[in-house]
Amino acid sequence: MMTGTIETTGNISAKKGGSVILQCHLSSTMAQVTQVNWEQHDHSLLAIRNAELGWHIYPAFKDRVAPGPGLGLTLQSLTMNDTGEYFCTYHTYPDGTYRGRIFLEVLESSVAEHSARFQIP
């Protein structure tokens, strides 16, 4: 039985040209995390963090994606095209797969505030 829950940074906004941290946290389970995948709204993989093999950032995103903090991901030099959904997928044993969703809105406005809150999707 899957007892865990994924907490994410929820709906966040950030300034064009700025950076933002995408974070997910798996709680309420004793399952072992083996890998965390980060996907973009079009389901293309941005990065993988494997417990044994470390990080793999996909070449198309190497210039604008930084690993961490922790199992999270930092998106840099944001453009308007980065607006959309992002997914963290936690592969665990024995529970299976947990998935969290974050919605990022990139704002033109110079007064855009970076807002982030933890929430359970």
Epitope: A51, E52, G54, W55, H56, A66, P67
Partner: antibody, heavy 120, light 107 residues
Framework: EVKLVESGPELVKPGASMKISCKAS????????MNWVKQSHGKNLEWIGL????????SYNQKFKGKATLTVDKSSSTAYMELLSLTSEDSAVYYC?????????????WGQGTLVTVSS | DIQMTQSPASLSASVGETVTITCRAS??????LAWYQQKQGKSPQLLVY???TLAEGVPSRFSGSGSGTQFSLKINSLQPEDFGSYYC?????????FGGGTKLEIK
């Protein structure tokens, strides 16, 4: 206390194969990945590969594919590395090394090393 | 593969001196770097991980710094037991690679 105890020194002939063991104690053997590292001429360190004792899954440095085969025996908490078709280039000290923890991919624990000498 | 380049290859110093060893990565490894000390005939011992975090039991005279591609290990007030070889290793993504080592000798 975490301990990794490797088998003793070996003198082997060119073309032969051999197996080194690494007996783990002081922790749950299946819970931590085991790595193997080669040290040539008392200097250069090279990562050979790793094995997940829980499921036997392996990952190798491309350079050592076909040269090293990693296995485990869960019942005795022992990791093994078989070295194939040995040449003088394989003369080195070989270490087993354990990660600090999951997602912590530095080597917090090392075996004492096994000296392998390939000579006719 | 990521290449790790260490310098100097060797250095001589006296007890009480401060020395710095550097390590350069061929690409950005952020802060995913470890340092090890190895004495003659012994296994390497972890000193630092995540570029600057001291491993348990490591004296505070050791300090690691750097990020991206440039890193250093500083040893303040060298003690007799600090002499030996030092290696850096990236822990960003496999294959893990090590620097060529720095041999620290007593002057």
């Amino acid at each position: 206390e975490v301990k990794l105890v490797e088998s003793g020194p070996e003198l082997v002939k060119p073309g032969a194969s051999m197996k080194i063991s690494c007996k783990a104690s002081g922790y749950s053997f299946t819970g931590y990945t085991m790595n193997w590292v080669k040290q040539s001429h008392g200097k250069n360190l090279e990562w050979i590969g790793l094995i997940n004792p829980y499921n036997g899954g392996t990952s190798y440095n491309q350079k050592f594919k076909g040269k090293a085969t990693l296995t485990v025996d869960k019942s005795s908490s022992t990791a093994y590395m078989e070295l194939l078709s040995l040449t003088s280039e394989d003369s080195a000290v070989y270490y087993c090394a354990r990660y600090a923890n999951r997602f912590e991919n530095w080597f917090a624990y090392w075996g004492q090393g096994t000296l392998v000498t390939v000579s006719s | 593969d990521i290449q790790m380049t260490q310098s100097p290859a060797s250095l001589s110093a006296s007890v009480g001196e401060t020395v710095t060893i550097t390590c350069r990565a061929s690409e950005n490894i952020y802060s995913y770097l470890a340092w090890y000390q190895q004495k003659q005939g012994k296994s390497p011992q972890l000193l630092v991980y995540n570029a600057k975090t001291l491993a348990e039991g490591v004296p505070s005279r050791f300090s690691g710094s750097g990020s991206g591609t440039q890193f250093s290990l500083k040893i303040n007030s060298l003690q007799p037991e600090d002499f030996g070889s030092y290696y850096c290793q990236h822990h960003y993504g496999t294959p893990w690679t090590f620097g060529g080592g720095t041999k620290l000798e007593i002057k």
